[in-house]
Interface confidence: medium
Amino acid sequence: MNNSTNSSNNSLALTSPYKTFEVVFIVLVAGSLSLVTIIGNILVMVSIKVNRHLQTVNNYFLFSLACADLIIGVFSMNLYTLYTVIGYWPLGPVVCDLWLALDYVVSNASVMNLLIISFDRYFCVTKPLTYPVKRTTKMAGMMIAAAWVLSFILWAPAILFWQFIVGVRTVEDGECYIQFFSNAAVTFGTAIAAFYLPVIIMTVLYWHISRASKSRIKKDKKEPVANQDPVSPSLVQGRIVKPNNNNMPSSDDGLEHNKIQNGKAPRDPVTENCVQGEEKESSNDSTSVSAVASNMRDDEITQDENTVSTSLGHSKDENSKQTCIRIGTKTPKSDSCTPTNTTVEVVGSSGQNGDEKQNIVARKIVKMTKQPAKKKPPPSREKKVTRTILAILLAFIITWAPYNVMVLINTFCAPCIPNTVWTIGYWLCYINSTINPACYALCNATFKKTFKHLLMCHYKNIGATR
């Protein structure tokens, strides 16, 4: 847009630079992107809220990311479209600065959330024994809060108070942009902190995740399951827990309810959680079996993730408590990333022949785990997780790089950037918020099913969708 002024009064020619059909096209495209961003991120947030199986530490990070992306979809995209289409900023300097502060703080919070997720995955892969213990809801909350606070500190004061720092507001009436972008040092500093440093960190983390996954795949290829030692009774930790209804396995973290079929424990579907890598990144390394004997119906049995369960029939005694023998990976409640130690839990029964039943069940399961699997399926989950993290990283770089390169160019050669190129670059950053829900959520089967239920208004049993 070329805002020429006449020499007498410097009044601005505030008119739309676009023809009517161009305005319609821009509004349709921008409106559609805004709508998709809003719907996508609301779906992520509502899914996590309504489905208890999605209420995991990993998904708290996604919830925070969705919050940031939703704000971008609601406010940033639409206000920028208005500004672009009508050719000037109609809402005054105060709203301008508030919009810019919100825009940059939230966009940066989105980036910081991506960074947190990368760190989380990195620690899951590189510290599988120590990190899950620390990976609590409280810690996740602190990390999320840090992301938002850091983003606020980085952008809000500079945007809101720069005019007072330098003593003059140099932004024209009818325009809205960051005043300090004329200051090379500040521009370079914020660009490095908000984009270049996160990109470098995320790239390094991805490289480490990729390397760890590749080494694990190689290790798996070298050691076929047929040659692995079967689980022997002496290796299994037996723990008798006195009768108690509270000793039922928790369902909060359950991901896929797999039954033992024909005496074989089926593998988790490889497609499950391909992006999240949710706690299943290394589930190829172990198979976990949970046998539950109780007076519950088969479909009432709940289980921890990574477990395979079978009902051993109803107890004859009406008053008998459940007997639960659980062999497999014992992992912290807070949706840990990788298995830690193998346990057998025998949850006792107060009914007749309780001990006898426990012994039979224990023997049967130990016997079953002794049978070596004929062939291990290709470890494609690690590859998939690594591939998806790469996709997320590339999506972030592709959508954010053009704008951040232009910002630097602008400090020493503003006319070098055509208006349309700048606008597209600015919009690309917003599009990252449209892509994020698809990148993270749509590759998770539980998310997908919950989305489907929400969109089709099937609210019955939505809280237990796996």
Partner: nanobody, 122 residues
Framework: QVQLQESGGGLVQPGGSLRLSCTAS?????????TTWYRQAPGKQRELVAV????????NYADSVKGRFTISRDDAKNTVYLQMNNLKPEDTAVYYC??????????????WGQGTQVTVSS
């Protein structure tokens, strides 16, 4: 808005010197402005005389004034200067100060002063 005020014009003999000043008020001429001196002789089109550009204070001059005129800028005083040496009668014109501000994704804003008369005559 930015108001530009020229000063320093007047009557001078051929071979003489003048220093024109262009002071910005309202908002500062920061490093995002390109500042230019134009001139317009009676009955002629406005022509570019000298530009003080964006990157690192680059300067450009019309062929007719090269070696005689010098453009400079003092950010502390929000002022752009045009030092005119070895003036010729054909330099007689009204001299205008112009500031161009590029706004990323928006384009340029042109700010003009009212002009100052320079007359070179013996």
């Amino acid at each position: 808005q930015v108001q530009l005020q020229e000063s320093g014009g007047g009557l001078v003999q051929p071979g003489g010197s003048l220093r024109l000043s262009c002071t910005a008020s309202g908002r500062s001429i920061s490093n995002i402005y390109a500042t230019t001196w134009y001139r317009q002789a009676p009955g002629k089109q406005r022509e570019l005389v000298a530009v003080f550009g964006y990157s690192g204070g680059t300067t450009n001059y019309a062929d007719s004034v090269k070696g005689r005129f010098t453009i400079s800028r003092d950010d502390a005083k929000n002022t752009v200067y045009l030092q005119m040496n070895n003036l010729k009668p054909e330099d007689t014109a009204v001299y205008y100060c112009n500031a161009v501000k590029y706004i990323p994704g928006r384009g340029e804003y042109d700010y003009w002063g009212q002009g100052t008369q320079v007359t070179v005559s013996s």
